[in-house]
Structure formats: C-alpha cells, structure tokens
C-alpha cells in the first residue's frame, strides 16, 4: 500500500481513532447502513467498505475524523492488495491441495458456524 | 444449506475425504490451479472454489471422491449463503460501528499481516 | 473558502522538466489529500495520483509512475507535480484537486495550468 | 485497470427536454461512481457522488444511480446551463478512473 506505515500499526491507529470520533460519527441518527449479520468479517470487506464511503458522506468535514477515513482508505487498499493475490501463482496440485486442507481446517476451528 | 447434515460436521467428513483422496487428486502432474500466497483465506473464497471445479474437471470420475466434491458443493453454498447475509439487514450507525470495530479487532490479533 | 490555485505551467521544451504548484488555503491542508488530473487539449480526463501531505503517502495511476512526482510542503500550503522527460503528448492542462480522503469524489477543483511541450 | 465507457459520447437535446447518460464498468465499482460536469475552459464540477448523493448546490434536476457496474445520469427538464461535457469517475477500484465523456450540445 502507498504509505510507510506498517499496515499492523495502521490498524491499531485506526481503533483508536474509531473510538476517539465515535460520538461524532453516530450524530446522524436517520442514516441506516448495512451491517452483515455474521462475524465471518473477511467475507464482508465489500459491504464494509461501502458502508465506511456512506458514513464518510454524512459526516462534517474536517478535523482530526479526517485522519480516520484517510486510515480506512489505506486499509482498504491493503485488502484489496491481498485480494489481488489470490489468483496471481498457479501451482501444482499438492499445493492447491494444502491451501483448501488449510482453508477448511481454519473454517472447522474458528469460523462461527450456524447450524 | 440444502442438507440434513450440519455445517461443522460437512467441514470435518470433508477434511478427512481430502486426506483419503490425495493420491487420487494428485496423479495429474502437469495441472496448475491458482493458489493465493497469503492465509487470510476467507478473502480467497471465490479462487478456492474455481480451484475446486477446475480439479474436480481434471479428475477421474466415480467412486467415493465424488463425494468428496459434493460436499465442497454443499460447502460453497453455505459460503454464498453468507455472504448474501453480508449486506441483508439495513442498521443504526452505532451497529455498524461496532461491527467496524470487531472487523478491524480482528484484523489486529488474527490476521497474518505482511509489513 | 476552499481555493486551490495552480502555478508552474508554459512552454517546455520535448525532454525538459517542470514542477507545477498548488496553493491551498481555505482549510487546514493537513486534513485532506489532494489530487492531480490531466486533461490534454480535446480530451477527456486523467487521473495521475494524489499525495496526502500529512502522511507524505503518495498513490500513482501506473501510467504516469515514471512521469510524475507528487510532494507537499506544509508550511506553506502546498502541493507539487514534478515531471520530468516532456513528451508532446504531455501538453495539457493540469488541474490540482481536493477530494474527500476515503470515497475519492473531487468535490473542490483549481483552476487549471496549462503545460505545452513544443 | 477499470475501463468506463459512457454512451452515448455525444448527443443533442433541447431545453425541457429531459436526457439519460450512462457509465458501464469493466468490473464491479460498488457505488463508488460519481459524475462531473465541465464546461470549456472551466475546472469540472461535481454533481452527483457514490452514485445517487447530489452534491450541495446541484439542482435537483440531476439525479443518479446504478451500482455495480451500470450507472446513469438523469437531468430532467434540460436548462440552458446544463450543455457542457458530462464525466463519470470510479474510485473504488486502482487506479481512479473516468469515462470518456459525453458531450450535451443544443439541439
């Protein structure tokens, strides 16, 4: 992503930052945006990062909330930066294999599962 | 999901069909399937599942390994059904707020995040 | 009011340089990024980066990555477009603009400076 | 890159007529579409942003929508002002991008 801050410290940043403006940010008490209704978060960055681009609309301009949106703009950029990496190398089977062994080891250990 | 069978158990028999099947799923050696290069795999979710159809198209069919793609078909639905419930329910800011906060929380204790 | 004013343009020579400016005042720099685009002689419009002179974070369309180098000073309220190896192809005006930081809409716009390689 | 291509790239009309431009995507741009006008030898103007939003001061003649990939602009009872060079923009995906732009001439 186009900045030297480390994406980690950028995040840790930006939750402070999120409950710093908290109160300014919920001023608006018409506004409706759609929030998902699971905790699997990665499945959700689209709606995530559009529901940030509606917030960001309502909200008065300037000041230090600024720097939160600007930190939320990075974030995105990181998620989409991985994104892009999920189809850029093509390997042999065995190691499309251990990737989906991964993938449905972490879904049977941490995801929430509904019955 | 359209079966009988809960999702957590579906992701367990499906684990261990991969590990019963591997000789099977390998013996074509000149296949490449994309595979993402980082483990936040819930980002990866579509790549993984072309993956999947492009394997099972180069693999021999019948036998029990044909339930082996079943029930990833099974699994694939309960993901698009998830992600359908990503941006369902229309809330106050205050709610999506929150579910801001524990999005970047997580990103923040269990994401492997590249400097 | 927000005022975005654009320097620097004129007539360059084809392999020469020239650093454009932007003077912003109005509102506190610091706050917001702020957006290059070209728009070369009946044409449309192009985006070349933006630079957020808080951070110092700089963010370029591929296209003009070996063209153009954005910077900020802030204390005097300004932005830069620095390109160097002038093309014909790189007569156009260029307008400096503010946007808001996450959605990306340009909602404050300058005046424009024109840059003609000849 | 996201490629935006408007149609039509020019078209005619008169005053109280009322016009349609659109914008169609390469690839999904969410809502993250927005729409400018310019008129010669001025800086453009935002008119409508994240699709439908109308920018302070627009009158309310502009209207948007779409998401996705297909989006378009309204502007009902045509004034005497509104012909000028209509631009759509992405800013969801890298690079930003904008369309080609649609020319509204007088009829």
């Known amino acids: 992503i186009p900045t030297e801050i480390p994406t980690s410290a950028l995040v840790k940043e930006t939750l402070a930052l999120l409950s710093t403006h908290r109160t300014l940010l919920i001023a608006n008490e018409t506004l409706r945006i759609p929030v998902p209704v699971h905790k699997n978060h990665q499945l959700c960055t689209e709606e995530i990062f559009q529901g940030i681009g509606t917030l960001e609309s309502q909200t008065v301009q300037g000041g230090t909330v600024e720097r939160l949106f600007k930190n939320l703009s990075l974030i995105k950029k990181y998620i989409d930066g991985q994104k892009k990496k999920c189809g850029e190398e093509r390997r042999r089977v065995n190691q499309f294999l251990d990737y989906l062994q991964e993938f449905l080891g972490v879904m049977n250990t941490e995801w929430i599962i509904e019955s | 999901i359209p079966t009988e069978i809960p999702t957590s158990a579906l992701v367990k028999e499906t684990l261990a069909l991969l590990s019963t099947h591997r000789t099977l799923l390998i013996a074509n050696e000149t296949l490449r399937i994309p595979v993402p290069v980082h483990k936040n795999h819930q980002l990866c979710t579509e790549e993984i599942f072309q993956g999947i159809g492009t394997l099972e198209s180069q693999t021999v069919q019948g036998g029990t390994v044909e339930r082996l793609f079943k029930n990833l078909s099974l699994i694939k639905k309960y993901i698009d059904g998830q992600k359908k419930k990503c941006g369902e329910e229309r809330r106050r800011v205050n709610q999506f707020l929150d579910y801001l906060q524990e999005f970047l929380g997580v990103m923040n204790t269990e994401w492997i995040i590249e400097s | 009011e927000v005022q975005l004013v654009e320097s620097g343009g004129g007539v360059v020579q084809p392999g020469g340089s020239l650093r454009l400016s932007c003077a912003a005042s109005g509102y506190t720099f610091t706050d917001y990024v702020l957006n290059w685009v070209k728009q070369a002689p009946g044409k449309g419009l192009e985006w070349i980066g933006w630079i957020d002179p808080d951070y110092g974070t700089t963010d370029y369309a591929e296209k003009f990555k070996k063209k153009a180098t954005l910077s900020a000073d802030t204390s005097r309220n300004s932005a830069y477009l620095q390109m160097n190896d002038l093309r014909p192809e790189d007569t156009a005006i260029y307008f400096c603009?503010?946007?808001?930081?996450?959605?990306?809409?340009?909602?404050?716009w300058g005046q424009g400076t024109l840059v003609t390689v000849s | 890159d996201t490629v935006l291509t408007q149609s039509p790239s020019s078209l005619s009309a008169s005053v109280g007529d009322s016009v349609t431009i659109t914008c169609r995507a390469s690839e999904s741009v969410s809502t993250f579409l927005h729409w400018y006008q310019q008129k010669p030898g001025k800086a453009p103007k935002l008119l409508i942003y994240l699709a439908s939003k109308l920018e302070s001061g627009v009158p309310a003649r502009f209207s948007g929508s779409g998401s996705g990939t297909d989006f378009s602009l309204t502007i009902r009872s045509l004034q005497p002002e509104d012909f000028a060079t209509y631009y759509c923009?992405?800013?969801?995906?890298?690079?930003?991008?904008f369309g080609q732009g649609t020319k509204l001439e007088i009829k």
């Open positions: 923009q992405q800013t969801w995906n890298d690079p930003r991008t």
């Open positions: 603009a503010r946007s808001r930081n996450y959605g990306g809409y340009i909602n404050y």
